[in-house]
């Protein structure tokens, strides 16, 4: 049997001992000083790093590696010579002392030595590859450094020229500003002169307006007697209609929905304990037809049914007769509740109408009519108003007596022209009259000198288009 053992002697030489039968063979191999063993801390993978080493450090390491390679090469040559010499000596000894069957042992030893040699060669190849790898990396790094240096130089040059250009531009602009300042002073002087002239004109116009207003007040007084007679008559008719509808509904038990509470208006919603602003479902009087409306449960005691809202121009108000009849838009935003519902509701009992207005300068105003109702569709949803109070003008901006409702496809105004087409939106136009809250929505700084805007003449004049409007109704006895 064979026993092959590898150990180190006291001097540090590698010692190979082979036991075969009664014979024992020992080989002593020289150990190179500069040649590190595989257990050395300088392992092969230490050369390959993800981040390249600093340049000087790399150069040093390269030199170390070159030395190691040279030493390894020398050591290999010595090893070959050593093996050959030993082999010759051993062969002679074996031939002299050993029997023929010792040949096998010698072959085994030779094989082991060759394996050792191959192992060393492989290690060298590894080191060589690593050196090449590192060299390539360093070359690339150097190339990158030089490229980035070039790039930085170019950028500096570009920036320098850019700075020069900007300096030129700056001085040019400075000159221009000075010239403009001179021009501006001249313009200001001419504007001041114009302003003085305009003030004279305005004062003249004010006196004319005052005279006209006096005439209008006189005309209004003359009209009020006729209006009172008409409204008293209408009130009597309304009372009769209410009495008739009450007796009819008493006979018709199907009107009341057992399973669901229904509300005629926001005042009923409020009285049922729902005192939060929001959208609620309302039921048409004497019908199961439903509509959703926004209820203002806070302003002036709450219970207000919003019948119109303008706030941002998001909804087109240039609509057909049918659309104004049934309503359009969204109760949470801009909308028109619908003439049919409002007509039916306001003919059931006495309602007040409040119109709330906002201008673009942060001012607010309102007009409150103590009695409001709309005629039926057959009478073109004519508006009826009585008893004006509020801060949006002493005179009603909805012409008195009330006019029929007009739309782009339903012209019922008192003008040869078609007011709805000309001023846009559906409204109770006269010829064409001092108001239109359903006109074109104009944004800030575009809202003046607009004949077709959102107009309330006796608050902001004829050409001013308002920022926001809300029309709301509530029972007079709320």
């Amino acid at each position: 049997y064979n026993n092959f053992r590898k150990s180190m002697d006291s001097i540090g030489k590698k010692q190979y001992q082979v036991q075969h039968g009664s014979c024992s063979y020992t080989f002593l191999l020289p150990e190179m000083d500069n040649c590190r063993s595989s257990s050395s801390p300088y392992v092969s993978n230490a050369v390959q790093r993800d981040a390249p080493l600093e340049y000087d450090d790399s150069v040093q390491r390269l030199q170390v590696l070159e030395n190691i390679m040279e030493n390894n090469t020398q050591w290999l040559m010595k090893l070959e010579n050593y093996i050959q010499d030993n082999m010759k000596k051993e062969m002679v000894e074996i031939q002299q002392n050993a029997v023929q069957n010792q040949t096998a042992v010698m072959i085994e030893i030779g094989t082991n030595l060759l394996n050792q040699t191959a192992e060393q060669t492989r290690k060298l190849t590894d080191v060589e590859a690593q050196v090449l790898n590192q060299t390539t990396r360093l070359e690339l790094q150097l190339l990158e450094h030089s490229l980035s240096t070039n790039k930085l130089e170019k950028q500096i040059l570009d920036q320098t020229s850019e700075i020069n250009k900007l300096q030129d531009k700056n001085s040019f602009l400075e000159k221009k500003v000075l010239a403009m300042e001179d021009k501006h002073i001249i313009q200001l002087q001419s504007i001041k002169e114009e302003k003085d002239q305009l003030q004279v004109l305005v004062s003249k116009q004010n006196s004319i307006i005052e005279e006209l207003e006096k005439k209008i007040v006189t005309a209004t007084v003359n009209n009020s007697v006729l209006q009172k007679q008409q409204h008293d008559l209408m009130e009597t008719v309304n009372n009769l209609l209410t009495m008739m509808s009450t007796s009819n509904s008493a006979k018709d038990p199907t009107v009341a929905k057992e399973e669901q509470i229904s509300f005629r208006d926001c005042a009923e919603v409020f009285k049922s304990g729902h005192t939060t602003n929001g959208i609620y479902t309302l039921t048409f009087p004497n019908s199961t037809e439903e509509i959703k409306a926004y209820c203002d449960m806070e302003a002036g005691g709450g219970g207000w049914t919003i019948i119109q809202r303008r706030e941002d121009g998001s909804v087109d108000f240039q609509r057909t007769w049918k659309e104004y009849k049934v309503g359009f838009g969204n109760p949470s935003g801009e909308y028109w509740l619908g003439n049919e519902f409002v007509s039916q509701l306001t003919n059931q009992q006495r309602y007040v109408l409040k119109i709330h207005l906002k201008d673009w300068e942060g001012n607010e105003a309102y007009s409150l009519y103590e009695h409001f109702y709309l005629s039926s569709e057959e009478l073109n949803y004519r508006i009826h108003l009585k008893g004006l109070t509020g801060t949006a003008g002493k005179i009603s901006s909805i012409s008195q007596p009330g006019n029929d409702f007009s739309t782009k496809d339903g012209d019922n105004d008192k003008c040869i022209c078609k007011c709805s087409q000309m001023l846009t939106g559906g409204w109770w136009f006269d010829a064409c009259g001092p108001s239109n809250l359903n006109g074109m929505y104009y944004p800030q700084r575009q809202n003046t000198n607009k004949f077709n805007g959102i107009k309330w003449y006796y608050w902001k004049g004829s050409g001013y288009s308002l920022k926001a409007t809300t029309m709301m109704i509530r029972p007079a006895d709320f």
């Epitope: 479902t281 039921t283 439903e290 509509i291 838009g329 949470s332």
Partner: antibody, heavy 119, light 107 residues
Framework: QVQLVESGGGLVKPGGSLRLSCAAS????????MYWIRQAPGKGLEWVST????????YYPDSVKGRFTISRDNAKNSLYLQMNSLRAEDTAVYYC????????????WGQGTLVTVSS | DIQMTQSPSSLSASVGDRVTITCKAS??????VAWYQQKPGKAPKLLIY???TRHTGVPSRFSGSGSGTDFTLTISSLQPEDFATYYC?????????FGQGTKVEIK
């Protein structure tokens, strides 16, 4: 753009419960009444429930009253339908829908979620 | 509740045909009727509301008419994409109720 996405459907045994959800986006959820509408396989559309903007008013047909509960969470832009005591005839695709504003015609619908009630 | 009865329940037609679907309400609903189109596996799509107002983006070949209790949806010239099921719905009062549907098939 307006989007309604239903979830929570699945297979459930008769007498069991299920909670459907509808995630809304692309509009101010708290400005609109919301609806559940269902469609049994091969059948027509049937309204199931309505909820008002604030959730104080809810409406149901007799077929689901007392078993189904509609609710909403305006902070989470979500609509829910809690379905209890489920029956085989409740098997349907359940759609969440939004109306136009003033009247209940349905402009926006979800893709639907299938509820199967079977033993 | 208001019942909505649609007729016919199904019909066969060819591309280019004029198709008429009717819907009858159990009580007067004024003009508060909407029409929807539904294709298999999809949610319904609004076509018409207030009996005759076309919803945004709906082709002009679709038209609606009627008031009171009798309503009609007309497709003037049937297109390949129009083969679907059509539903009427009243939006007059709660609960909103639908017709049973009309399936338009290829002849």
């Amino acid at each position: 753009q307006v989007q309604l996405v239903e979830s929570g459907g699945g297979l459930v045994k008769p007498g069991g419960s299920l909670r459907l959800s509808c995630a809304a986006s692309g509009f101010t959820f708290s400005d609109y009444y919301m609806y559940w509408i269902r469609q049994a396989p091969g059948k027509g559309l049937e309204w199931v429930s309505t909820i008002s903007v604030g959730g104080s008013f809810t409406y149901y047909p007799d077929s689901v009253k007392g078993r189904f509960t509609i609710s909403r969470d305006n902070a989470k832009n979500s609509l829910y339908l809690q379905m209890n005591s489920l029956r085989a005839e409740d098997t349907a695709v359940y759609y969440c829908a939004r109306d136009w504003g003033l009247r209940p015609w349905f402009v926006y619908w979800g893709q639907g979620t299938l509820v199967t009630v079977s033993s | 509740d208001i019942q909505m009865t649609q007729s016919p329940s199904s019909l066969s037609a060819s591309v280019g045909d004029r198709v008429t679907i009717t819907c009858k309400a159990s009580q007067d609903v004024s003009t508060a009727v909407a029409w929807y189109q539904q294709k298999p596996g999809k949610a319904p799509k609004l076509l018409i509301y207030w009996a005759s107002t076309r919803h945004t983006g709906v082709p002009s070949r679709f038209s609606g008419s009627g008031s009171g209790t009798d309503f009609t949806l007309t497709i003037s010239s049937l297109q390949p994409e129009d083969f679907a099921t059509y539903y009427c719905q009243q939006h007059y009062s709660t609960p909103p109720t639908f017709g049973q549907g009309t399936k338009v098939e290829i002849k």
